[in-house]
């Protein structure tokens, strides 16, 4: 966002004051509360970064994220019999991604049309609430999944209903927490008309009084509580997991597990480096600069960081792939345009031909869940 301050207000999140109504007079519009942005912010709002680069990235995220997370949710809900904690966390992760990604066509259209929001105040608030909600949900569910994966290695007990119930309880608590922490994003006026550019922005220009203090405090609190603390837990879980895997016996099966664990760790690390760290860092820096200087010199970086944060919806399916045997099979089959039933039939005939017990290790039954690496 830039700060938009009100003329009695001008803008740049760009800063400004709320309650701007307007009425048309001949060619132009007479505004009751005017938000004027600085030249740098205006160049960002009208430049190729926001009108070409962002829609391209969001289109990729939508095209990749919608089907992959949709399939993941379907697999976890309907093709996985035993709902292990990992499955529950991944199902929630996929749901969070879907709830964010479904609004992307509006976001893409908004940027393509020069950052002009024509879909009304309510839809803008929903889009922004879900946008940030997805990021913080992803961080928290990823933390739960990471801690759970470590727990499975330390404590390799069988599936229990109690563990699944605990995971469901934690998931509901996370959704409730995210709903509560994103309330300010739904309540605050997010759409603002910029007379100089003849556009109505959604979240890119926000009211001055709000931004100066409250937004900095808000995003700083979220960065500490919902990013840094979970990131520390995730990192700790993976460091301990690597130690455990190093010291464990090295048969062929555990070597496979170790490789998949490393792939998972690399994927989660990439997600933090690309999606979560830049966005949370720049949210704080951006709003700090507005609070202290009245304008943000990192606005373009902040825009890019927030855009890259949406890539988590494309990276999450790789997490499902390295954790869930079921998702792995469905993903492979979907990519090869084969049905699971066909693959099963092939495996059954293979098994009957070989009369070998070993062949069952290739089985990818969709009725059993293997959340091991």
């Amino acid at each position: 966002t830039i700060q938009g301050t009100n003329r009695s207000s001008k803008g740049r999140s760009l800063i400004g004051k709320v309650d701007g109504t307007s009425h048309v007079t001949g060619k132009g519009v007479t505004v009751e509360t005017v938000f004027s942005v600085d030249e740098f912010s205006a160049s960002v709002l009208t430049g190729k970064l926001t009108t070409v680069f962002l829609p391209i990235v969001y289109t990729i995220v939508f095209v990749v994220g919608l089907p992959s997370n949709g399939m993941a949710l379907w697999v976890f809900l309907f093709r996985t019999k035993k709902k292990h904690p990992a499955v529950i966390y991944m199902a929630n992760l996929a749901l969070a991604d879907l709830l964010s990604v479904i609004w992307f066509p509006l976001k893409i259209a908004y940027h393509i049309h020069g950052n002009n929001w024509i879909y009304g105040e309510a839809l803008c608030n929903v889009l922004i609430g879900f946008f940030y909600g997805n990021m913080y949900c992803s961080i928290l569910f990823m933390t739960c999944l990471s801690v759970q994966r470590y727990w499975v290695i330390v404590n390799p007990m069988g599936h229990s209903r109690k563990k699944a119930n605990i995971a469901i309880g934690i998931s509901l608590a996370i959704w409730l927490l995210i709903l509560l922490v994103t309330i300010p994003l739904y309540v605050v006026k997010q759409t603002i008309f910029i007379p100089a550019l003849n556009i109505t922005t959604c979240h890119d220009v926000l009211p001055e009084q709000l931004l100066v203090g409250d937004m900095f405090n808000y995003f700083l609190s979220l960065a500490i509580g919902v990013f840094l603390f979970p990131a520390f837990l995730t990192a700790s879980a993976y460091v301990l997991m690597i130690r455990m895997l190093r010291s464990s016996a090295m048969d062929e099966n555990s070597e496979k597990k170790r490789k998949r664990a490393i792939k998972l760790i690399v994927t989660v690390l990439a997600m933090y480096l690309i999606c979560f760290t830049p966005s949370n860092l720049l949210l704080v820096v951006h709003y700090f600069l507005i609070k202290s200087q009245g304008q943000s010199h990192v606005y373009a970086l902040y825009i890019v960081a927030l855009c890259l944060s949406t890539l988590n919806s494309c990276i999450d399916p790789f997490v499902y792939y390295f954790v869930s045997h079921d998702f792995r099979d469905h993903a492979k089959n979907a990519l090869l345009c084969r049905s699971v039933r066909t693959v099963k039939q092939m495996q059954v005939s293979l098994t009957s031909k070989k009369h070998s017990r070993k062949s069952s290790s290739y089985s990818s039954s969709s009725t059993t869940v293997k959340t091991s690496y």
């Epitope: 301050t5 003329r7 132009g28 007479t30 942005v37 007379p195 100089a196 003849n198 009245g294």
Partner: antibody, heavy 119, light 106 residues
Framework: QVQLQESGPGLVKPSETLSLTCTVS????????VIWIRQPPGKGLEWIGV???????YYNPSLKSRVTISVDTSKNQFSLKLSSVTAADTAVYYC?????????????WGQGTLVTVSS | EIVLTQSPATLSLSPGERATLSCKAS??????LDWYQQKPGQAPRLLIY???SLHTGIPARFSGSGSGRDFTLTISSLEPEDFAVYYC????????FGGGTKVEIK
Amino acid sequence: QVQLQESGPGLVKPSETLSLTCTVSGFSLNSYGVIWIRQPPGKGLEWIGVIWGNGNTYYNPSLKSRVTISVDTSKNQFSLKLSSVTAADTAVYYCARWRGYKDYPFDYWGQGTLVTVSS
Amino acid sequence: EIVLTQSPATLSLSPGERATLSCKASQNIYKYLDWYQQKPGQAPRLLIYNTNSLHTGIPARFSGSGSGRDFTLTISSLEPEDFAVYYCLQHNSGWTFGGGTKVEIK
């Protein structure tokens, strides 16, 4: 070079409408707008309203019920109309160029035109 | 509405002396303050914009400083043509002019 020139009647009767024109040259009306400012004799400066190059306007809340600012791009002119004038509206009226962005000042001004409201 | 208070109202100095004009805002306006010079019968002329940026063609003896609420215009060595009225203008939230400071010959 950049030039702004205010013109209009020097005398207006109370309750009538004051009409002024600001003719500009040396810059594009697509990129710049103007702000109207007035200065009562021996007093300070007060802004009246602003118009962007795209025709959007914003008026001083204390005057907005009486003010209309418009642009005629074909003539390179901005106009100011102030209705129901009183003696308190007697002032030198200036138009000044503005880029329309927060960090831009009013860099070029017209020489001003004195408008007296009297019967 | 933001109020700008200029002081002193009148500054009596001799040519060659240093002039320091003050402008105080009722709330934080960051760097968004400009200085204008006005001579009798003339339109105001922009000197300094955004606190300390010198406008094209303005002599280097004019300089601006400050941030937040307190701002200063300094004329390092007064020339005869510098005796005029100086206005500050804030454009962080709306537009407000200060009451002016008259710099007169002592």
